[in-house]
C-alpha cells in the first residue's frame, strides 16, 4: 500500500533506501529538454514474490525538439555527473537483485534521466538519513524512518537525527554504532512492519552496497 | 495531502470557448503529468490528454486535438485546458488529475446551451 | 485505441459476499491497468495501480489481479460503502482508455 506523504524532512539532511519493496514506483522523469516517450512507461515499479523482485517498465526518453528519439541505453559517463550524487556513487548493480527478499535494488540510470529520482514508497520501507556534506551528525537515536499504518492512515517514523554545520562529513548510514544497532531503537518507534532481521540485512546492504543516489525530492 | 481543485461550473453559449482551471497541492507540481478526463452520462470516461508542467509537454488523444488545448501555469501551479468552438456535445464533466500516483479533482460541470 | 471492456454493466450483491469485477482489454497491456471506485456525485478515487497494487487508505477488501488482457477487481466482504460504479483504465498506451463502468448494487 503507497504511503500517503513523503519521509520526514531534516534540515541539512538527505534520505534514501538501501532496496526498495515491492510496490513502489519510480517516475519515469526526464531532464531538462527531454520528455518521456509517448506511450512510455509512465514509472517503473517494483515487482516480484519473495524469492525474486526486479523492476517492471523502463523509462524512455526523447529530446522534446526531436520526438522520434527512443533510444535505451546507459549514460555515458559526463551524462551521469548530471545526477545528484554522492562520494559513494560507483557502479550500478544489476537490476535484479533478491538479497533482501521482497525487495529491489535501486534501479539503473536511464538515457537522459532527470538529476533527481522521484520514488513512492509503500507501507513498511525504510528510508536512512545522512547529513548533507559540511554537517556532522548528532545522534539521539537511529538516523532512519520506517512508512507505518496505524488507524488506516500512512505516517513515518521520525527519525533521531540532528545535523550541525562542522566541516566533517559523516560515513553512511552513520558512523556510530548505536545507530546500526536494532536495541538502539526506542521502543515507541519498532515497527511491526519492519523486523530486526530486516534492519540487520538491510544495515549490512547499507556497509556493502555499491548503489548511493541520493534524492531530495520524492513526491 | 495532494489535492486538485478546479474551478466552478460553467454555462456558455454554443460556438463560444471556455478555459476551465486546475490548482494544484500538496506536490511538486511541475514534476508530475496531469491529465483531463471528461465524462458524460452514457458515454463513460474519456482521456483527452495529458501535459508536463515542467516542460510544457502534451499528449492529447486525437480525439480532442483542435478541441482541447492544455496549458499550465507553473508559479501558480495551475493547469489549464481551453475547449474551443463548443457544441451540446462538449456538455460533460470534466476532471483533472495527476496522473501518477493517481488524484482527481472534484470536476467541473460545463453546460453548453443556447 | 485499446478498448477495455466491462461486460457487466451492473452487480447485485449483498453486505458481506465476495463479488469480482471484471474487465477485458483488447489487446496486451501488460499489467497498466488502474481500477477506481466512483460514488454518485464524486470524482473517481484511484484503488488499485499497477493491476493489483492497492492505493493509500484502499480497505484490503480491495484486490486487483490480471495481466495482458484479463484484469479483475475482487471486493471480499462487501460493505454497504462500497455502492459504486468501477471503471478499469488502460495506461499502456495512447490515448489511454477505459471501461464502461459496472455498477455495484446492493440488495
Known amino acids: 500500500e503507497l504511503c500517503d506523504d513523503d519521509p520526514p524532512e531534516i534540515p541539512h539532511a538527505t534520505f534514501k533506501a538501501m532496496a526498495y519493496k515491492e510496490g513502489t514506483m519510480l517516475n519515469c522523469e526526464c531532464k531538462r529538454g527531454f520528455r518521456r516517450i509517448k506511450s512510455g512507461s509512465l514509472y517503473m515499479l517494483c515487482t516480484g514474490n519473495s524469492s525474486h523482485s526486479s523492476w517492471d517498465n523502463q523509462c524512455q526518453c526523447t529530446s522534446s525538439a526531436t520526438r522520434n528519439t527512443t533510444k535505451q541505453v546507459t549514460p555515458q559517463p559526463e551524462e551521469q555527473k548530471e545526477r545528484k550524487t554522492t562520494e559513494m556513487q560507483s557502479p550500478m548493480q544489476p537490476v535484479d537483485q533478491a538479497s533482501l527478499p521482497g525487495h529491489c535494488r535501486e534501479p539503473p540510470p536511464w538515457e537522459n534521466e532527470a538529476t533527481e529520482r522521484i520514488y513512492h514508497f509503500v507501507v513498511g520501507q525504510m528510508v536512512y538519513y545522512q547529513c548533507v556534506q559540511g554537517y556532522r551528525a548528532l545522534h539521539r537515536g537511529p538516523a532512519e524512518s520506517v512508512c507505518k499504518m496505524t488507524h488506516g492512515k500512512t505516517r513515518w517514523t521520525q527519525p533521531q537525527l540532528i545535523c550541525t554545520g562542522e566541516m566533517e562529513t559523516s560515513q553512511f548510514p552513520g558512523e556510530e554504532k548505536p545507530q546500526a544497532s536494532p536495541e538502539g531503537r526506542p521502543e515507541s518507534e519498532t515497527s511491526c512492519l519492519v523486523t530486526t532481521t530486516d534492519f540487520q540485512i538491510q544495515t549490512e546492504m547499507a556497509a556493502t552496497m555499491e548503489t548511493s543516489i541520493f534524492t531530495t525530492e520524492y513526491q | 495531502q495532494v489535492q486538485m481543485q478546479q474551478s466552478g461550473a460553467e454555462l456558455v453559449r454554443p460556438g463560444t470557448s471556455v478555459k476551465i482551471s486546475c490548482k494544484a497541492s500538496?506536490?511538486?507540481?511541475?514534476?508530475?503529468?496531469l491529465g483531463w478526463v471528461k465524462q458524460r452520462p452514457g458515454h463513460g470516461l474519456e482521456w483527452i490528454g495529458d501535459i508536463y508542467p515542467g516542460g510544457g509537454y502534451t499528449n492529447y488523444n486525437e480525439k480532442f486535438k483542435g478541441k482541447a488545448t492544455l496549458t499550465a501555469d507553473t508559479s501558480s501551479s495551475t493547469a489549464y485546458m481551453q475547449l474551443s468552438s463548443l457544441t451540446s456535445e462538449d456538455s460533460a464533466v470534466y476532471f483533472c488529475a495527476r496522473v501518477t500516483p493517481a488524484s482527481w479533482g472534484q470536476g467541473t460541470t460545463l453546460t453548453v446551451s443556447s | 485505441d485499446i478498448q477495455m471492456t466491462q461486460s457487466q454493466k451492473f452487480m447485485s450483491t449483498s453486505v458481506g459476499d465476495r463479488v469480482s469485477v471484471t474487465c477485458k482489454a483488447s489487446?496486451?497491456?501488460?499489467?497498466?491497468v488502474a481500477w477506481y471506485q466512483q460514488k454518485p456525485g464524486q470524482s473517481p478515487k484511484a484503488l488499485i495501480y499497477?493491476?493489483?497494487y492497492r492505493y493509500s487508505g484502499v480497505p484490503d477488501r480491495f484486490t486487483g489481479s490480471g495481466s495482458g488482457t484479463d484484469f479483475t477487481l475482487t471486493i471480499s466482504n462487501v460493505q454497504s460503502e462500497d455502492l459504486a460504479e468501477y471503471f478499469c483504465q488502460q495506461y499502456n498506451s495512447y490515448p489511454w482508455t477505459f471501461g464502461g463502468g459496472t455498477k455495484l448494487e446492493i440488495k
Open positions: 500538496g506536490y511538486t507540481f511541475t514534476n508530475y503529468w
Open positions: 489487446q496486451n497491456v501488460g499489467t497498466n
Open positions: 499497477s493491476a493489483s
